[in-house]
Amino acid sequence: SEVEYRAEVGQNAYLPCFYTPAAPGNLVPVCWGKGACPVFECGNVVLRTDERDVNYWTSRYQLKGNFYKGDVSLTIENVTLADSGIYCCRIQIPGIMNDEKFNLKLVIKPAKVTPAPTRQRDFTAAFPRMLTTRGHGPAETQTLGSLPDINLTQISTLANELRDSRLANDLRDSGATIRIG
């Protein structure tokens, strides 16, 4: 399933991507790229992490969540229409064909001329609430055989996090469209 996110020109856009390290700080490499996920890595890399830290990023692309707990969600600051498109989040899990690949569609709308209603919030401010949301869909668990110290519960998409969630309406008001396929 493809998940679609919307933001207005000039706003910050938030593209969620998560995994659960076996232990805090037991990290795996992650890359973000513009374009659908290819066979390996990410195309047109905009941000990359290794087992310790963010080791490559460009100015408007940031991780603002708790990277050390597996929140590798991407924030794109001050978006323009050119930021529209598919983004790939790739979680490079050791083992045979274990990489998690997520394609997220970002739609940028022209800025509204009229003042925004008070109901609408900054996209970035709206989404951190989701980190405390209890997922209602079953989590997908992967045990990586004999690989040491890694047993990841993948949060496969934001759609799983939000399935049947009362936040869905809130998010729709914030401009996010969740398509569960």
Partner: antibody, heavy 120, light 107 residues
Framework: QVQLQESGPGLVKPSQTLSLTCTVS??????????WSWTRQHPGMGLEWIGY???????YYTPSLKSRLTISVDTSKNQFSLKLSSVTAADTAVYYC????????????WGQGTLVTVSS | EIVLTQSPATLSLSPGERATLSCRAS??????LAWYQQKPGQAPRLLIY???NRATGIPARFSGSGSGTDFTLTISSLEPEDFAVYYC?????????FGGGTKVEIK
């Protein structure tokens, strides 16, 4: 500059296991940024990607060989290897090891290739 | 798996001429297409990645174009060392696949 060198027996009997090693020089196999791969080329034919192992430990095998294939890394020897079990004459090929730069895919390095013949 | 069809199978040209090689994918590969050159007895050499980006050290006479399903490798003016077999490779979907190759030979 990274250099790669394949080694292993040039002749393997049918039903046995083909084992090849690729020795990496000019760089550490455990440092980030490279994918270590195997590709083969049947005599007079085109190229067939076999699989890769990444700097992070991600491993991908081509589906047609997956059940017979193992790719692994030995960081202490700066080598990675290929094992292909239950070989037949159809596995006769030149086997190439290669590394791909993951930081934009703008360069890769290949070994010179080694011919493996499967015959009794 | 994605099938890559290269045409023509053989291209007979003289040094200094322009070579145009085609690669067509059975489904979209976005821009995740690479071109390799292979000479007899040698390993393949990466020329172009992501459809249009020249790899490190590749001369400017090599250029790539296209996206989706149709791609072209152009050699603007053939040098003697350019006569070889050229393969396209898609990196969009697993398994990675190569085209059958185009042989550029001296006319």
């Amino acid at each position: 500059q990274v250099q790669l060198q394949e080694s292993g027996p040039g002749l393997v009997k049918p039903s046995q296991t083909l084992s090849l090693t690729c020795t990496v020089s000019g760089g550490s196999i455990s440092s980030g940024g490279y994918y270590w791969s195997w590709t083969r080329q049947h005599p007079g034919m085109g190229l067939e990607w076999i699989g890769y192992i990444s700097y992070s430990g991600s491993i991908y095998y081509t589906p047609s060989l997956k059940s017979r294939l193992t790719i692994s890394v030995d960081t202490s020897k700066n080598q990675f290897s290929l094992k292909l079990s239950s070989v037949t004459a159809a596995d006769t090929a030149v086997y190439y090891c290669a590394s791909l730069d993951s930081w934009g895919s703008n360069r890769d390095y290949w070994g010179q290739g080694t011919l493996v013949t499967v015959s009794s | 798996e994605i099938v890559l069809t290269q045409s023509p199978a053989t291209l007979s040209l003289s040094p200094g001429e322009r070579a145009t090689l085609s690669c067509r994918a059975s489904q979209s590969v976005s821009s995740y297409l690479a071109w390799y050159q292979q000479k007899p007895g040698q390993a393949p050499r990466l020329l172009i990645y992501d459809a249009s980006n020249r790899a490190t050290g590749i001369p400017a006479r090599f250029s790539g174009s296209g996206s989706g399903t149709d791609f072209t490798l152009t050699i603007s003016s053939l040098e003697p060392e350019d006569f070889a077999v050229y393969y396209c490779q898609q990196r969009s979907n697993w398994p990675l696949t190569f085209g059958g190759g185009t042989k550029v030979e001296i006319k």
